[in-house]
């Protein structure tokens, strides 16, 4: 297993609709034909997998149908979008990239992106 550098932004603020997007960039040593991208969430020293997708050359990045993630890939960059976020989902989101093919296998883990989610204030009732 060989190490690989992965870069991602330090901080991202989710939109009022609970959507956060960030770019995950990896330093590929060659042209990879199969890349696996996993988003991990670290909170209170617990790490959980948020979503994962394998990108095969000639195809787009496809997450499972029920995934809260979507993404596109361009060269050595993956543009990730996480939806349906609420204030309780605030945490460090780590991008893990694995170059599955061709051999050798490379693994890179980013430092994480702190995503802040603020639940929108409910609209006050208005009298007309």
């Amino acid at each position: 297993c060989k190490a690989m550098h992965v870069a991602q932004p330090a901080v991202v603020l989710a939109s009022s609709r609970g959507i956060a997007s960030f770019v995950c960039e990896y330093a590929s040593p060659g042209k990879a034909t199969e890349v696996r991208v996993t988003v991990l969430r670290q909170a209170d020293s617990q790490v959980t997998e948020v979503c994962a997708a394998t990108y095969m050359m000639g195809n787009e990045l496809t997450f499972l149908d029920d995934s809260i993630c979507t993404g596109t890939s361009s060269g050595n960059q993956v543009n990730l979008t996480i939806q349906g976020l609420r204030a309780m989902d605030t945490g460090l989101y780590i991008c893990k990239v694995e170059l599955m093919y061709p051999p050798p296998y490379y693994l890179g883990i980013g430092n994480g992106t702190q995503i802040y989610v603020i639940d929108p204030e409910p609209c006050p009732d208005s009298d007309f």
């Epitope: 297993c1 199969e34 050359m57 694995e98 061709p102 051999p103 296998y105």
Partner: antibody, heavy 118, light 110 residues
């Protein structure tokens, strides 16, 4: 000299499971990806799946997804293919093969015949 | 399961040349230069003969050559010999699965 030596023939009943082993020698075990390919009697080659020894990550043919698993024992330099809920149509010679890079299989085991019959 | 189409059989006399075709689509053979060819004698494991469309592994006779045009790859055996009688399979990367094999071609030396 790179070598892959597979376990002997197996006869199983429908619904049972079978495990085929593939002992590797002559190369650094974790460096080479391993594939499994099967061939039904008188039929062509069918790709079963691939394992990356250094990570344990596997990818399988959609046809067999859910019934197949691939594992490895690094200390024994051995790969294993397990196929569960066997059906008569799983009767085939199962081969392990090393990945030469660029989607080719450069060294092959001698094959293991698995017969599924009631 | 996608499959690459090969002729069921080809034959030739000793010393002649024979060519086996392997037809796919732009999602496999036509889209990438990851075409391989394997030789399989009865009761034996397959042996890699050609990779990356036209490259030969060390130890494989230069009588075996590979090429590709559009969605079709070809394996040519020149100076046909008795020991070339075997089944031949092509394989290719495909964007839906890492590996797909051809239907296989039986080569008979007359």
């Amino acid at each position: 000299q790179m070598q892959l030596v597979q376990s002997g023939a197996e006869v199983k009943k429908p619904g049972a499971s079978v495990t085929v082993s593939c002992k590797a020698s002559g190369y650094t075990f974790t460096n080479s990806y391993i594939h499994w390919v099967r061939q039904a009697p008188g039929q062509g080659l069918e790709w079963v799946g691939r394992l990356i020894p250094s990570s344990g990550y596997t990818i399988f043919s959609q046809k067999l997804q859910g019934r197949v698993s691939m594992t490895r024992d690094t200390s024994m330099s051995t790969h294993y293919l397990t196929l569960s809920h066997l059906r008569p149509e799983d009767t085939a010679v199962y081969y392990c093969a090393t990945d030469g890079g660029n989607y080719n299989l450069d060294f092959w085991g001698q094959g293991t015949l698995v017969t599924v019959s009631s | 399961q996608p499959v690459l189409t090969q002729p069921p059989s080809v034959s030739g006399s000793p010393g002649q040349s024979v060519t086996i075709s392997c037809t796919g689509t732009s999602s496999d053979v036509g889209g990438y230069n990851y075409v391989s060819w394997y030789q399989q004698h009865p009761g034996k494991a397959p042996k890699l003969m050609i990779y990356d469309v036209s490259s030969r592994p060390s130890g494989v006779s230069n009588r075996f050559s590979g090429s590709k045009s559009d969605n079709t790859a070809s394996l040519t055996i020149s100076g046909l010999q008795a020991e070339d009688e075997a089944d031949y399979y092509c394989s290719s990367y495909t964007s839906s699965s890492p590996y797909v094999f051809g239907t296989g071609t039986k080569v008979t030396v007359l």
